[in-house]
């Protein structure tokens, strides 16, 4: 039975040209995390963090995606096109797959918001699918 919950940074905002940290955390389960996949709103993969093999950043994002902190992901040199949904998919054993959602809004540099993940954010909880 899947008992885990994914907590994410929820809805966040950051300035154009800045950076932001996408973070998910799986709790309330003893399941072993074998892999975490980070996916963008158009379903393209940003990165995979395999528990044993390490990080694979997808070629299209290598110049502006940095692994970490932890199982999270740092997006750099943000553009307006980066606005949208991001998903962390936790592959676990024996539970199966858990998924968390983050919504990122990229703001024009002259506007409000923060960089480095320091903008507004609300923590969201997600249960298994």
């Amino acid at each position: 039975m899947m008992t885990g919950t994914i907590e994410t940074t929820g809805n966040i905002s950051a300035k154009k040209g800045g950076s932001v940290i996408l973070q998910c955390h799986l709790s309330s389960t003893m399941a072993q995390v074998t892999q975490v996949n980070w996916e963008q709103h158009d379903h393209s993969l940003l990165a995979i963090r395999n528990a044993e093999l390490g990080w694979h950043i997808y070629p299209a994002f290598k110049d502006r995606v940095a692994p970490g902190p932890g199982l999270g992901l740092t997006l750099q040199s943000l553009t307006m096109n980066d606005t949208g949904e991001y998903f962390c998919t936790y592959h676990t054993y024996p539970d199966g797959t858990y998924r968390g959602r983050i919504f990122l809004e990229v703001l024009e540099s002259s506007g409000g918001g923060g960089a480095g993940g320091g903008g507004h954010h609300h923590h969201h909880h997600h249960h298994h699918h």
Epitope: T34, Q35, N37, E39, H43, S44, L45, I48, N50, E52, L53, G54, W55, H56, Y58, P59, A60, H91
Partner: antibody
Framework: QVQLQESGPGLVKPSETLSLTCAVY?????????WHWIRQPPGKGLEWIGY???????NYNPSLKSRVTISVDTSKNQFSLKLSSVTAADTAVYYC??????????????WGQGTLVTVSS | DIQMTQSPSSLSASVGDRVTITCKAS??????VAWYQQKPGKAPKLLIY???YRYTGVPSRFSGSGSGTDFTFTISSLQPEDIATYYC?????????FGGGTKLEIK
């Protein structure tokens, strides 16, 4: 240039243990990457068996897990496959391969030439 | 396990033809797909990774595309040395699986 070379007996009796080694040339297996075994039954497709990571951790195909052991001999810069309780269904060409996960994800960029193992009495 | 279904299982084409092979995943694998070429009696060779990126030294006539569940491998102008069996592989999940292969022959 990285090179991998499989070796081991070409004939194994049913119920016995298949043992193969993969010698790695041009790279120290304890320096990085993961090192895999894949097999291909005659006229059929490829099946991933498992790997040993340079750190020593292992991961196996669930369908074979109860019978498979992959280990590293650092002194000889080689890694090995043991598959127990073999049957005719284990007859295949066995390949060793390297995975550069950081650059190519789960794609395998260097392969050995393969060695045919026949299970027969 | 994620199943990878390739089609066709075999095909015959002429030198200079555009050749297309498809691979369908049993579930969404985003762009975590590789393509290999295997010539008779030889080991597979990596051609494409991350669905559309050519591996080092791979000729530009080889290309890959797709995301989600549907993937395509294309040879823009078939050469005699391209006669081989081609395999797709997914690595979205932690258990890697391959397609059944497509055997390519010259007419």
């Amino acid at each position: 240039q990285v090179q991998l070379q499989e070796s081991g007996p070409g004939l194994v009796k049913p119920s016995e243990t298949l043992s193969l080694t993969c010698a790695v040339y041009g790279y120290s297996i304890t320096s990085g990457y993961s090192w895999h075994w894949i097999r291909q039954p005659p006229g059929k497709g490829l099946e991933w068996i498992g790997y040993v990571h340079y750190s020593g951790s292992t991961n196996y195909n669930p369908s074979l897990k109860s019978r498979v052991t992959i280990s590293v001999d650092t002194s000889k810069n080689q890694f090995s496959l043991k598959l127990s309780s073999v049957t005719a269904a284990d007859t295949a060409v066995y390949y060793c391969a390297r995975m550069d996960y950081g650059n190519y994800g789960g794609a395998m960029d260097y392969w050995g030439q393969g060695t045919l193992v026949t299970v027969s009495s | 396990d994620i199943q990878m279904t390739q089609s066709p299982s075999s095909l015959s084409a002429s030198v200079g033809d555009r050749v297309t092979i498809t691979c369908k995943a049993s579930q969404d694998v985003r762009t975590a797909v590789a393509w290999y070429q295997q010539k008779p009696g030889k080991a597979p060779k990596l051609l494409i990774y991350s669905a559309s990126y050519r591996y080092t030294g791979v000729p530009s006539r080889f290309s890959g595309s797709g995301s989600g569940t549907d993937f395509t491998f294309t040879i823009s102008s078939l050469q005699p040395e391209d006669i081989a069996t081609y395999y797709c592989q997914q690595y979205y999940s932690t258990q890697w699986t391959f397609g059944g292969g497509t055997k390519l022959e010259i007419k």
